[in-house]
Each structure stands twice: as structure tokens, then as C-alpha cells.
């Protein structure tokens, strides 16, 4: 009877085990995360000759080493340094495109304008784009059930710290005229709390960056306002100017036409404003 009780208790404990795992508010690690990262690295190095020296095995292991066995609310930028070292890559001057709250259009643009690069066109950004990941303290397991949410759980989680780390590096290495695409449909066109506003803006190097040119993307077809006069854009201008970097702003009234004109600049309709 006593043995039976122990056995039953063990059975209950076994079935309860998944609930003991730390429950976070965010979605869990993306399915097949290791395979996805490795496959993306292989694919990237195949199509980018300048990165063909990169050892994807070491890249994956450095990525994994940044968060595996670590408490997922205590990740630091230091944890990602081995990965950053392996993924070192430079963008030619005048070819950096930052973005805030308008990722899809920024990526559509660099897919057409192949000589310009967003962070997600670089190896490390490409590896992690749209993925979620986290581990658990003192185990070698990846947590596929839940991961910390930036707002509800903690900001020092594996995903947030990764993007902060690589965004900082991306901004630090930019040179010449840097462009940023901003979403004119949002209440805060420039948001100080976005990755662009809190990390990238402050890590542009005045000795290397001559100017920041903002492209404010309009949402409505009939929207003819000059969104470059928006108070948040003026705030961005002030921050940038104080850092001894010149600031320019352009309204992109018709994003569809804008993309079309990037594809076909000779088109007669592209000679007028977009």
C-alpha cells in the first residue's frame, strides 16, 4: 500500500512536471528553431560571396550559447558577443537603411534596391528575423512552450537583447548618409521607445555619419500633409542635430508608386513627386 502511494504520487508529479516549468507570457521558441537558424545561415552564405568564409556550425553554436542554460530574464549583450564576432559584416557608406514600425516596406525596398541594406539583410538579422527563442536556467533545453514577453515579463530576454545588440552594432558601423523609413500612419511617427529611437539613433557615430535622411511613409492615398513637420519628427531632428549629424526629411506620399519608381526609375510618371 505504501509503495502504491509513492508510485501514485510519482505519477502525479510526472504529469504535473510541465506546469513546473517557468510559464512566461510570450509565445514559445519557434518550432524547429535550431534547424531554421542553421538552414538560414547556410542559405545566406551561399548567396553572399563575401560571407562564404563563415562557419555556420560555429555561428549556430554561438547563437545557442547566448541563451541556453541561462535564466531568460537575465540575458546580456555580452552573451551575444561571440555570435556578433562571427557575424561581423560591413555595409558600404550611404547604403544603410534603418526602419521603424514599417518593416515590410523597408524589406520590399531593399529587395529592389539591392545595394541598400536593412539589418535583416545582414547575416545576423537574417538568421533571427521573425523568430522567437529562449532557454531555461540550468538545463540544456530550448523552451518551446513560452518565452518572456518584453512588457509583461522582462526586457532582458533573449530576443529583445539580441535585437538591441545587433541594432546597436548595425548603427555603430553605419557611415555616410544613413536613411530611415518611418511609418506616417502611426500616432508617434518617431517613437523614442522603438529600437530605432532608443538604440540606433544614439549609436550613429557623428565622425562617420554625415546625415540622417528620414523617409516618412504616408498611409492614405489622399494624405497630402507634410508629415516632416510632425512634432515627433521635430523631436528626432533635435536629437540628431545635437549629435552633430545633419537631418533631412522627405514625405513619401505614395509608397506603391515609390517602389514602382525604384524598380523603373525611367518611367515618365516617376519624374514628378512621389
Amino acid at each position: 500500500s505504501g509503495l502504491n502511494d509513492i508510485f501514485e504520487a510519482q505519477k502525479i508529479e510526472w504529469h504535473e512536471l510541465p506546469r513546473w516549468r517557468q510559464q512566461w507570457s510570450g509565445s514559445g521558441t519557434t518550432s524547429r528553431f535550431p534547424e531554421t537558424v542553421l538552414a538560414r545561415c547556410v542559405k545566406y552564405t551561399e548567396v553572399h560571396p563575401e560571407m562564404r568564409h563563415v562557419d555556420c556550425q560555429s555561428v549556430w553554436d554561438a547563437f545557442k550559447g547566448a541563451f541556453i542554460s541561462k535564466y531568460p530574464c537575465n540575458i546580456t549583450e555580452e552573451d551575444y558577443q561571440p555570435l556578433v564576432k562571427l557575424g561581423t559584416q560591413t555595409v558600404p557608406c550611404n547604403k544603410t537603411l534603418l526602419w521603424s514600425r514599417i518593416k515590410d516596406l523597408a524589406h520590399q525596398f531593399t529587395q529592389v534596391q539591392r545595394d541598400m541594406f536593412t539589418l535583416e539583410d545582414m547575416l545576423l538579422g537574417y538568421l533571427a528575423d521573425d523568430l522567437t527563442w529562449c532557454g531555461e536556467f540550468n538545463t540544456f533545453e530550448i523552451n518551446y512552450q513560452s518565452c518572456p514577453d518584453w512588457r509583461k515579463d522582462c526586457s532582458n530576454n533573449p530576443v529583445s537583447v539580441f535585437w538591441k545588440t545587433v541594432s546597436r552594432r548595425f548603427a555603430e558601423t553605419a557611415c555616410g548618409v544613413v536613411h530611415v523609413m518611418l511609418n506616417g500612419s502611426r500616432s508617434k511617427i518617431f517613437d523614442k521607445n522603438s529600437t530605432f529611437g532608443s538604440v540606433e539613433v544614439h549609436n550613429l557615430q557623428p565622425e562617420k555619419v554625415q546625415a540622417l535622411e528620414a523617409w516618412v511613409i504616408h498611409g492614405g492615398r489622399e494624405d497630402s500633409r507634410d508629415l516632416c513637420q510632425d512634432p515627433t519628427i521635430k523631436e528626432l531632428e533635435s536629437i540628431i542635430s545635437k549629435r552633430n549629424i545633419r537631418f533631412f526629411c522627405k514625405n513619401i506620399y505614395r509608397p506603391d508608386k515609390f517602389l514602382q519608381c525604384v524598380k523603373n526609375p525611367e518611367d515618365s510618371s516617376c519624374l514628378s513627386g512621389i
Epitope: 538552414a39 547556410v42 542559405k43 568564409h53 562557419d55 555556420c56 556550425q57 560555429s58 553554436d61 562571427l86
Partner: antibody
Framework: QSLEESGGRLVTPGTPLTLTCTVS????????MAWVRQAPGKGLEYIGI?????TTYYATWAKGRFIVSKTSTTVDLKITSPTTEDTATYFC??????????WGPGTLVTVSS | DIVMTQTPASVEAAVGGTVTINCQAS??????LAWYQQKPGQRPKLLIY???TLASGVSSRFKGSGSGTEFTLTISDLASADAATYYC??????????FGYGFGGGTEVVVK
């Protein structure tokens, strides 16, 4: 850039043996190194790898039978409990995203009672 | 683990002829495949990497093709020095759940 294996010899079954690969002109912190073996008259087979980051992986058949480790200039392969089936030439190789592009000359291990 | 299936195990051809060796991977390895030539008592020699790129100093008579899971090595204008065993190799990478490194069983090429 070169690799050279050493430590191959005649051992009796069950006697642990460590092979060493000494590298020259190679930064082991950024390259994945592997051990490959070839039994007499047979094909090539992977045993395991150690990445630049230092993580080890093994072919399923090799798990528990071999241990790969490294220092800044050497990559070691420990055969934990050799059997006669482990008689082979053992190669140390460098693997890049392009290929396994650099091979040592190999070292012969003979396991016999 | 990845399984590399190489065919045929042996092939015989005359000098000046052409030999084709096939290699099939059990999973998608993109272009992460190499071909090696090995002669008795020697270490393997790299012929082709990235499925189709000729290694430095290798004759253009050796041609690699394919991607994903199906790959081919073609040796044209066969010479007596080409008599050797040829291996395909995957170097796709490893995770805790898969070991993406492996060799095919080898193909012995006999030149008449």
C-alpha cells in the same frame, strides 16, 4: 595551414586511447574541426565534430564511445574503450562552409588482443 | 543522422570515356556537398565543393551538379590516373537533434 595527427598505436581492447591533432596556422575559435576514420578497405565515416564555439556533436553510432575536445592549438579524440572494430586510420579535418578542405595525413590505430 | 546514398558501388569505363556517380542525401543539404578522390594509402583529395565548384588545381574534366538532395559527379575524358575511389560528403551542420555530416559509401572507378 596544416594538420597532423599523432597518438595512433597498437592497443588492447578496453584500453583508452587519445589521439591528438596539432594545427598550424588555423584559428580554432572560428573553424569547425572533425574526426573522420577509415577502417582497412572500407569507406570514410564521421565520428564527431567540435565547432569554433567549442560545442561537440557526434554521429549516433559514436556517442559514448568517443570524446572530442580542443585547446587553442590541438584537437583531441579520446577512444574511451576501444574494440577491434575501432581499428582504422583516423583523420583530423577542418570543415568550413565550403567543404572539409584540409586533411591531416592520418594516424593508424590497431586494436588487438 | 544524415544518410548519404552513393551509386553505383563500382563502375568500369574505358580511357576517354565518361563516368557518372550519383549521391542522394536523406535531407535537404542545399549545396553543402563535396566530392573527394582517394587512392590507396593516401588521404582523400577534394575535387568539388558547394556541389559544383571546382577545387583549386583540379581538372575541369570533373563536374559536379545538383542541389537539395540529389547530386551528381561526372568525370569526362577518363584518364588512367582517374582510377580511384570517389566519395560524396555532406557538411550541412549539426544540431542537438541531427548530425548533418556524412559520407557516401564510395564508388570505385576502374579504368580499362
Amino acid at each position: 595551414q596544416s594538420l597532423e595527427e599523432s597518438g595512433g598505436r597498437l592497443v588492447t581492447p578496453g584500453t583508452p586511447l587519445t589521439l591528438t591533432c596539432t594545427v598550424s596556422g588555423i584559428d580554432l575559435s572560428i573553424y569547425t574541426m572533425a574526426w573522420v576514420r577509415q577502417a582497412p578497405g572500407k569507406g570514410l565515416e564521421y565520428i564527431g565534430i567540435i565547432s569554433g564555439y567549442g560545442t561537440t556533436y557526434y554521429a549516433t553510432w559514436a556517442k559514448g564511445r568517443f570524446i572530442v575536445s580542443k585547446t587553442s592549438t590541438t584537437v583531441d579524440l579520446k577512444i574511451t574503450s576501444p574494440t577491434t572494430e575501432d581499428t582504422a586510420t583516423y583523420f583530423c579535418v577542418r570543415t568550413t562552409v565550403q567543404s572539409t578542405d584540409l586533411w591531416g595525413p592520418g594516424t593508424l590505430v590497431t586494436v588487438s588482443s | 543522422d544524415i544518410v548519404m546514398t552513393q551509386t553505383p558501388a563500382s563502375v568500369e569505363a574505358a580511357v576517354g570515356g565518361t563516368v557518372t556517380i550519383n549521391c542522394q542525401a536523406s535531407q535537404n543539404i542545399y549545396s553543402n556537398l563535396a566530392w573527394y578522390q582517394q587512392k590507396p594509402g593516401q588521404r582523400p583529395k577534394l575535387l568539388i565543393y558547394k556541389a559544383s565548384t571546382l577545387a583549386s588545381g583540379v581538372s575541369s574534366r570533373f563536374k559536379g551538379s545538383g542541389s537539395g538532395t540529389e547530386f551528381t559527379l561526372t568525370i569526362s575524358d577518363l584518364a588512367s590516373a582517374d582510377a580511384a575511389t570517389y566519395y560524396c560528403q555532406s557538411y550541412y551542420g549539426a544540431t542537438s537533434s541531427s548530425f548533418g555530416y556524412g559520407f557516401g559509401g564510395g564508388t570505385e572507378v576502374v579504368v580499362k
